[in-house]
Interface confidence: low
Protein backbone atom coordinates (compact mmCIF):
# COMPACT_ATOMS: atom_id res chain seq x y z
CA UNK A 1 0.00 0.00 0.00
CA UNK A 2 1.26 3.45 -0.90
CA UNK A 3 2.50 5.57 1.99
CA UNK A 4 0.08 8.17 3.29
CA UNK A 5 2.81 10.40 4.68
CA UNK A 6 2.71 14.01 3.59
CA UNK A 7 5.44 14.68 1.06
CA UNK A 8 6.75 17.93 -0.38
CA UNK A 9 8.08 17.35 -3.88
CA UNK A 10 10.56 20.16 -4.40
CA UNK A 11 13.65 18.70 -5.95
CA UNK A 12 16.86 19.70 -4.27
CA UNK A 13 19.02 22.43 -5.79
CA UNK A 14 16.06 23.69 -7.78
CA UNK A 15 16.27 27.15 -9.29
CA UNK A 16 14.16 29.71 -11.14
CA UNK A 17 15.51 32.60 -13.16
CA UNK A 18 12.83 35.30 -13.31
CA UNK A 19 12.48 38.92 -14.29
CA UNK A 20 11.59 41.72 -11.89
CA UNK A 21 8.22 43.20 -12.79
CA UNK A 22 6.76 39.93 -14.02
CA UNK A 23 4.13 37.96 -12.13
CA UNK A 24 5.40 34.62 -10.85
CA UNK A 25 3.99 31.63 -8.99
CA UNK A 26 6.30 29.56 -6.82
CA UNK A 27 4.79 26.12 -6.41
CA UNK A 28 5.20 23.73 -3.52
CA UNK A 29 3.98 20.32 -4.71
CA UNK A 30 2.29 18.56 -1.80
CA UNK A 31 1.13 14.94 -1.64
CA UNK A 32 -1.36 13.99 1.06
CA UNK A 33 -4.05 11.37 1.43
CA UNK A 34 -6.93 12.58 3.60
CA UNK A 35 -6.74 15.94 5.35
CA UNK A 36 -4.84 18.69 3.63
CA UNK A 37 -1.94 19.81 5.81
CA UNK A 38 -1.26 23.38 6.83
CA UNK A 39 1.52 24.60 4.55
CA UNK A 40 3.58 27.77 4.82
CA UNK A 41 6.35 29.42 2.85
CA UNK A 42 9.46 30.95 4.38
CA UNK A 43 12.48 32.77 2.97
CA UNK A 44 15.97 31.79 4.06
CA UNK A 45 17.98 34.44 5.85
CA UNK A 46 21.28 32.84 6.73
CA UNK A 47 20.50 29.74 8.75
CA UNK A 48 16.98 30.80 9.69
CA UNK A 49 13.89 30.67 7.53
CA UNK A 50 11.65 33.70 7.98
CA UNK A 51 7.95 32.86 7.67
CA UNK A 52 6.10 34.77 4.93
CA UNK A 53 2.83 35.52 6.67
CA UNK A 54 1.59 38.55 4.76
CA UNK A 55 2.02 37.17 1.24
CA UNK A 56 -0.69 35.99 -1.11
CA UNK A 57 -0.89 32.21 -1.34
CA UNK A 58 -3.36 29.76 -2.85
CA UNK A 59 -3.95 26.06 -3.44
CA UNK A 60 -4.19 24.37 -6.81
CA UNK A 61 -5.51 20.82 -6.79
CA UNK A 62 -4.59 18.25 -9.42
CA UNK A 63 -5.43 14.57 -9.68
CA UNK A 64 -2.30 13.11 -8.11
CA UNK A 65 -0.83 16.07 -6.32
CA UNK A 66 -1.68 19.52 -4.96
CA UNK A 67 0.27 22.75 -5.17
CA UNK A 68 0.60 25.41 -2.49
CA UNK A 69 1.45 28.54 -4.43
CA UNK A 70 3.30 31.64 -3.30
CA UNK A 71 2.30 34.55 -5.54
CA UNK A 72 4.68 37.29 -6.64
CA UNK A 73 2.62 40.05 -8.21
CA UNK A 74 4.92 41.40 -9.42
CA UNK A 75 8.40 40.03 -8.73
CA UNK A 76 10.60 42.60 -6.97
CA UNK A 77 14.42 42.70 -7.01
CA UNK A 78 14.55 41.88 -3.30
CA UNK A 79 12.57 38.68 -3.91
CA UNK A 80 15.92 37.21 -4.93
CA UNK A 81 16.86 34.35 -2.59
CA UNK A 82 16.02 30.88 -1.38
CA UNK A 83 12.58 29.72 -0.26
CA UNK A 84 11.27 26.68 1.51
CA UNK A 85 7.79 25.34 2.11
CA UNK A 86 6.83 23.49 5.28
CA UNK A 87 3.84 21.34 6.12
CA UNK A 88 2.35 20.79 9.55
CA UNK A 89 0.71 17.38 9.69
CA UNK A 90 -0.40 15.56 12.83
CA UNK A 91 2.01 17.68 14.89
CA UNK A 92 4.89 16.81 12.55
CA UNK A 93 6.78 19.47 10.62
CA UNK A 94 7.93 18.43 7.15
CA UNK A 95 10.26 20.78 5.32
CA UNK A 96 11.01 20.84 1.62
CA UNK A 97 14.35 21.34 -0.03
CA UNK A 98 14.97 25.00 -0.72
CA UNK A 99 14.31 26.50 -4.13
CA UNK A 100 16.23 29.56 -5.27
CA UNK A 101 14.90 32.53 -7.21
CA UNK A 102 17.39 34.49 -9.28
CA UNK A 103 15.75 37.82 -9.99
CA UNK A 104 17.04 39.88 -12.89
CA UNK A 105 16.25 43.56 -12.56
CA UNK A 106 15.06 44.56 -16.05
CA UNK A 107 16.48 48.06 -15.66
CA UNK A 108 19.97 46.67 -15.21
CA UNK A 109 19.69 43.86 -17.74
CA UNK A 110 21.37 45.07 -20.91
CA UNK A 111 20.60 41.86 -22.77
CA UNK A 112 18.45 38.79 -22.53
CA UNK A 113 19.70 36.07 -20.18
CA UNK A 114 21.94 33.52 -21.86
CA UNK A 115 20.30 30.37 -23.10
CA UNK A 116 23.43 28.35 -22.45
CA UNK A 117 22.84 25.34 -20.28
CA UNK A 118 23.55 26.20 -16.68
CA UNK A 119 23.53 22.75 -15.16
CA UNK A 120 25.37 19.63 -16.15
CA UNK A 121 23.28 17.66 -13.67
CA UNK A 122 19.70 17.05 -14.76
CA UNK A 123 17.89 18.77 -11.91
CA UNK A 124 14.25 19.52 -12.48
CA UNK A 125 12.25 21.81 -10.28
CA UNK A 126 9.31 19.53 -9.65
CA UNK A 127 7.50 16.58 -11.03
Amino acid sequence: KESCDVQLYIKRQSEHSILAGDPFELECPVKYCANRPHVTWCKLNGTTCVKLEDRQTSWKEEKNISFFILHFEPVLPNDNGSYRCSANFQSNLIESHSTTLYVTDVKSASERPSKDEMASRPWLLYR
Epitope: Y9, H16, S17, N64, P113, S114, D116, E117, M118
Partner: antibody, heavy 127, light 108 residues
Framework: QVQLVESGGGVVQPGRSLRLSCEAS????????MNWVRQAPGKGLEWVAV????????YFADSVKGRFTISRDNSKNTLYLQMNSLRAEDTAVYYC????????????????????WGQGTTVTVSS | EIVLTQFPGTLSLSPGERATLSCRAS???????LAWYQQKPGQAPRLLIY???SRATGIPDRFSGSGSGTDFTLTISRLEPEDFAVYYC?????????FGQGTRLEIK
Protein backbone atom coordinates in the same frame (compact mmCIF):
# COMPACT_ATOMS: atom_id res chain seq x y z
CA GLN B 1 29.17 3.53 -24.69
CA VAL B 2 25.96 4.63 -22.97
CA GLN B 3 23.85 1.53 -22.51
CA LEU B 4 20.87 0.10 -20.63
CA VAL B 5 20.32 -3.66 -20.46
CA GLU B 6 17.11 -5.11 -19.05
CA SER B 7 16.72 -8.64 -17.68
CA GLY B 8 14.33 -10.68 -15.58
CA GLY B 9 11.44 -11.10 -18.00
CA GLY B 10 9.69 -14.41 -18.54
CA VAL B 11 6.41 -16.28 -18.39
CA VAL B 12 4.54 -16.04 -15.10
CA GLN B 13 1.09 -17.01 -13.87
CA PRO B 14 -1.52 -14.39 -12.93
CA GLY B 15 -1.18 -13.27 -9.32
CA ARG B 16 2.51 -14.12 -9.17
CA SER B 17 5.50 -11.77 -8.92
CA LEU B 18 8.49 -10.91 -11.06
CA ARG B 19 11.42 -8.55 -10.65
CA LEU B 20 12.98 -6.81 -13.63
CA SER B 21 16.47 -5.33 -13.59
CA CYS B 22 18.07 -2.70 -15.77
CA GLU B 23 21.84 -2.37 -15.68
CA ALA B 24 23.31 0.96 -16.77
CA SER B 25 26.78 1.59 -18.13
CA UNK B 26 28.68 4.37 -19.85
CA UNK B 27 27.20 7.26 -17.83
CA UNK B 28 26.93 8.51 -14.27
CA UNK B 29 23.82 6.61 -13.27
CA UNK B 30 23.09 8.53 -10.07
CA UNK B 31 22.71 11.80 -12.00
CA UNK B 32 19.61 10.67 -13.85
CA UNK B 33 15.97 9.97 -13.15
CA MET B 34 14.99 6.57 -14.57
CA ASN B 35 11.73 5.29 -16.04
CA TRP B 36 10.06 2.03 -16.90
CA VAL B 37 7.89 2.09 -20.04
CA ARG B 38 6.01 -0.89 -21.39
CA GLN B 39 4.46 -1.94 -24.69
CA ALA B 40 1.76 -4.58 -24.92
CA PRO B 41 1.82 -6.74 -28.08
CA GLY B 42 0.70 -4.67 -31.05
CA LYS B 43 -0.02 -1.64 -28.84
CA GLY B 44 1.56 1.72 -28.10
CA LEU B 45 3.94 2.88 -25.40
CA GLU B 46 2.67 3.14 -21.81
CA TRP B 47 4.67 4.86 -19.10
CA VAL B 48 4.83 2.70 -15.96
CA ALA B 49 6.98 4.38 -13.30
CA VAL B 50 9.76 6.83 -12.59
CA UNK B 51 12.30 7.18 -9.79
CA UNK B 52 14.36 10.26 -9.05
CA UNK B 53 18.11 10.14 -9.41
CA UNK B 54 18.67 9.76 -5.66
CA UNK B 55 15.71 7.43 -5.15
CA UNK B 56 13.89 9.98 -3.00
CA UNK B 57 10.66 10.08 -4.99
CA UNK B 58 8.74 7.58 -7.09
CA TYR B 59 5.67 7.89 -9.28
CA PHE B 60 3.50 5.23 -10.88
CA ALA B 61 0.86 4.95 -13.57
CA ASP B 62 -2.62 4.36 -12.15
CA SER B 63 -2.72 0.94 -13.85
CA VAL B 64 0.14 -0.40 -11.70
CA LYS B 65 -0.16 1.66 -8.53
CA GLY B 66 -0.11 -0.49 -5.42
CA ARG B 67 1.17 -3.53 -7.33
CA PHE B 68 4.50 -2.40 -8.79
CA THR B 69 7.48 -0.90 -6.98
CA ILE B 70 10.40 0.91 -8.58
CA SER B 71 13.79 1.08 -6.89
CA ARG B 72 17.44 1.60 -7.71
CA ASP B 73 20.85 0.73 -6.36
CA ASN B 74 23.18 3.52 -7.43
CA SER B 75 26.20 1.63 -6.13
CA LYS B 76 25.40 -1.13 -8.63
CA ASN B 77 24.18 1.16 -11.43
CA THR B 78 20.98 -0.84 -11.49
CA LEU B 79 17.28 -0.01 -11.71
CA TYR B 80 14.57 -2.45 -10.61
CA LEU B 81 10.87 -3.00 -11.16
CA GLN B 82 9.20 -5.32 -8.66
CA MET B 83 5.91 -6.50 -10.15
CA ASN B 84 3.41 -8.15 -7.80
CA SER B 85 -0.14 -9.45 -8.34
CA LEU B 86 0.52 -9.70 -12.06
CA ARG B 87 -2.41 -9.66 -14.47
CA ALA B 88 -2.82 -10.75 -18.09
CA GLU B 89 -2.92 -7.08 -19.09
CA ASP B 90 0.62 -6.61 -17.73
CA THR B 91 1.89 -8.75 -20.62
CA ALA B 92 4.29 -6.48 -22.52
CA VAL B 93 7.83 -5.65 -23.44
CA TYR B 94 9.27 -3.60 -20.58
CA TYR B 95 11.86 -0.93 -21.35
CA CYS B 96 13.95 1.09 -18.96
CA UNK B 97 14.77 4.59 -20.13
CA UNK B 98 16.99 7.41 -18.93
CA UNK B 99 15.34 10.79 -18.60
CA UNK B 100 17.22 14.05 -19.02
CA UNK B 101 16.41 17.62 -18.11
CA UNK B 102 18.46 20.66 -17.32
CA UNK B 103 18.09 24.22 -16.15
CA UNK B 104 18.61 26.93 -18.73
CA UNK B 105 19.41 30.41 -17.50
CA UNK B 106 16.79 32.14 -19.61
CA UNK B 107 13.95 31.02 -17.31
CA UNK B 108 13.43 27.86 -19.37
CA UNK B 109 13.62 24.41 -17.87
CA UNK B 110 14.39 22.12 -20.79
CA UNK B 111 13.03 18.61 -20.86
CA UNK B 112 15.23 16.50 -23.10
CA UNK B 113 13.01 13.44 -22.99
CA UNK B 114 14.02 9.82 -22.64
CA UNK B 115 17.23 9.78 -24.60
CA UNK B 116 18.57 6.30 -23.84
CA TRP B 117 16.48 3.13 -23.88
CA GLY B 118 17.23 -0.51 -23.19
CA GLN B 119 16.43 -3.24 -25.69
CA GLY B 120 13.46 -4.39 -23.60
CA THR B 121 12.57 -7.57 -21.72
CA THR B 122 9.37 -9.52 -22.36
CA VAL B 123 6.93 -10.33 -19.60
CA THR B 124 4.11 -12.77 -20.38
CA VAL B 125 1.38 -13.28 -17.78
CA SER B 126 -0.56 -16.38 -18.62
CA SER B 127 -2.07 -19.36 -16.88
CA GLU C 1 -4.01 13.48 -16.51
CA ILE C 2 -3.19 15.01 -19.88
CA VAL C 3 -4.33 12.82 -22.78
CA LEU C 4 -2.39 13.04 -26.04
CA THR C 5 -4.26 12.14 -29.23
CA GLN C 6 -2.29 11.52 -32.40
CA PHE C 7 -3.68 11.72 -35.91
CA PRO C 8 -3.90 10.29 -38.39
CA GLY C 9 -3.63 6.80 -36.94
CA THR C 10 -1.98 5.62 -40.14
CA LEU C 11 -0.32 7.71 -42.83
CA SER C 12 0.46 6.15 -46.23
CA LEU C 13 3.06 8.04 -48.24
CA SER C 14 5.83 7.42 -50.74
CA PRO C 15 9.56 8.06 -50.29
CA GLY C 16 10.39 11.64 -51.17
CA GLU C 17 7.03 12.97 -49.97
CA ARG C 18 6.44 15.24 -46.99
CA ALA C 19 4.87 13.76 -43.83
CA THR C 20 2.92 15.77 -41.28
CA LEU C 21 2.01 14.06 -38.02
CA SER C 22 -0.16 15.73 -35.40
CA CYS C 23 -0.42 15.44 -31.63
CA ARG C 24 -3.23 17.14 -29.71
CA ALA C 25 -3.26 17.49 -25.92
CA SER C 26 -6.43 17.46 -23.82
CA UNK C 27 -5.11 20.54 -22.01
CA UNK C 28 -2.29 22.98 -22.57
CA UNK C 29 1.20 21.51 -22.45
CA UNK C 30 4.39 23.53 -22.07
CA UNK C 31 6.25 23.18 -25.35
CA UNK C 32 9.40 22.71 -23.24
CA UNK C 33 7.96 19.39 -22.07
CA LEU C 34 6.91 17.76 -25.35
CA ALA C 35 8.97 15.10 -27.12
CA TRP C 36 8.65 12.87 -30.19
CA TYR C 37 9.94 9.31 -30.63
CA GLN C 38 10.36 6.93 -33.54
CA GLN C 39 9.96 3.18 -33.15
CA LYS C 40 10.71 0.51 -35.71
CA PRO C 41 9.46 -3.10 -35.38
CA GLY C 42 11.39 -5.08 -32.82
CA GLN C 43 13.36 -2.04 -31.66
CA ALA C 44 13.24 0.30 -28.69
CA PRO C 45 11.91 3.82 -29.24
CA ARG C 46 14.39 6.49 -30.35
CA LEU C 47 14.20 10.10 -29.23
CA LEU C 48 13.75 12.44 -32.20
CA ILE C 49 12.58 15.82 -30.89
CA TYR C 50 12.58 17.43 -27.46
CA UNK C 51 11.19 20.76 -26.33
CA UNK C 52 8.64 20.44 -29.17
CA UNK C 53 11.11 21.66 -31.79
CA SER C 54 14.72 20.74 -30.96
CA ARG C 55 16.31 17.77 -32.70
CA ALA C 56 18.00 15.18 -30.52
CA THR C 57 21.63 14.28 -31.14
CA GLY C 58 22.18 12.57 -34.48
CA ILE C 59 18.71 13.20 -35.86
CA PRO C 60 18.72 14.32 -39.53
CA ASP C 61 17.48 17.81 -40.28
CA ARG C 62 14.60 16.51 -42.41
CA PHE C 63 12.85 15.95 -39.04
CA SER C 64 11.34 19.05 -37.47
CA GLY C 65 8.88 19.73 -34.69
CA SER C 66 6.59 22.68 -34.03
CA GLY C 67 3.56 23.74 -32.07
CA SER C 68 2.48 25.07 -28.70
CA GLY C 69 -0.41 24.90 -26.28
CA THR C 70 -2.47 21.90 -27.28
CA ASP C 71 -1.38 21.33 -30.89
CA PHE C 72 1.99 19.94 -31.91
CA THR C 73 3.34 18.72 -35.23
CA LEU C 74 6.17 16.49 -36.37
CA THR C 75 7.20 17.07 -39.98
CA ILE C 76 9.46 14.92 -42.12
CA SER C 77 10.32 17.11 -45.08
CA ARG C 78 11.38 14.38 -47.52
CA LEU C 79 10.71 10.78 -46.57
CA GLU C 80 13.55 8.28 -46.75
CA PRO C 81 12.88 4.52 -46.78
CA GLU C 82 14.19 4.21 -43.20
CA ASP C 83 11.63 6.75 -41.93
CA PHE C 84 8.69 4.35 -42.21
CA ALA C 85 7.92 3.48 -38.59
CA VAL C 86 5.59 4.35 -35.72
CA TYR C 87 5.89 7.82 -34.18
CA TYR C 88 4.85 8.79 -30.66
CA CYS C 89 4.49 12.14 -28.94
CA UNK C 90 5.07 12.32 -25.20
CA UNK C 91 4.54 14.94 -22.53
CA UNK C 92 6.24 15.34 -19.20
CA UNK C 93 3.80 16.15 -16.41
CA UNK C 94 4.51 16.99 -12.81
CA UNK C 95 3.53 13.54 -11.64
CA UNK C 96 2.56 11.64 -14.78
CA UNK C 97 4.19 11.04 -18.13
CA UNK C 98 1.89 10.25 -21.05
CA PHE C 99 2.39 9.07 -24.60
CA GLY C 100 0.12 9.48 -27.58
CA GLN C 101 -1.27 6.28 -29.10
CA GLY C 102 1.09 6.58 -32.06
CA THR C 103 0.93 7.26 -35.80
CA ARG C 104 2.01 4.49 -38.16
CA LEU C 105 3.84 5.85 -41.19
CA GLU C 106 3.70 3.25 -43.95
CA ILE C 107 4.90 3.04 -47.53
CA LYS C 108 2.17 3.72 -50.06
Amino acid sequence: QVQLVESGGGVVQPGRSLRLSCEASGFTFNNYDMNWVRQAPGKGLEWVAVIWNDGSNKYFADSVKGRFTISRDNSKNTLYLQMNSLRAEDTAVYYCAREVFTMVRGIIITYYGMDVWGQGTTVTVSS
Amino acid sequence: EIVLTQFPGTLSLSPGERATLSCRASQSVSSSYLAWYQQKPGQAPRLLIYGASSRATGIPDRFSGSGSGTDFTLTISRLEPEDFAVYYCQQYGRSIITFGQGTRLEIK
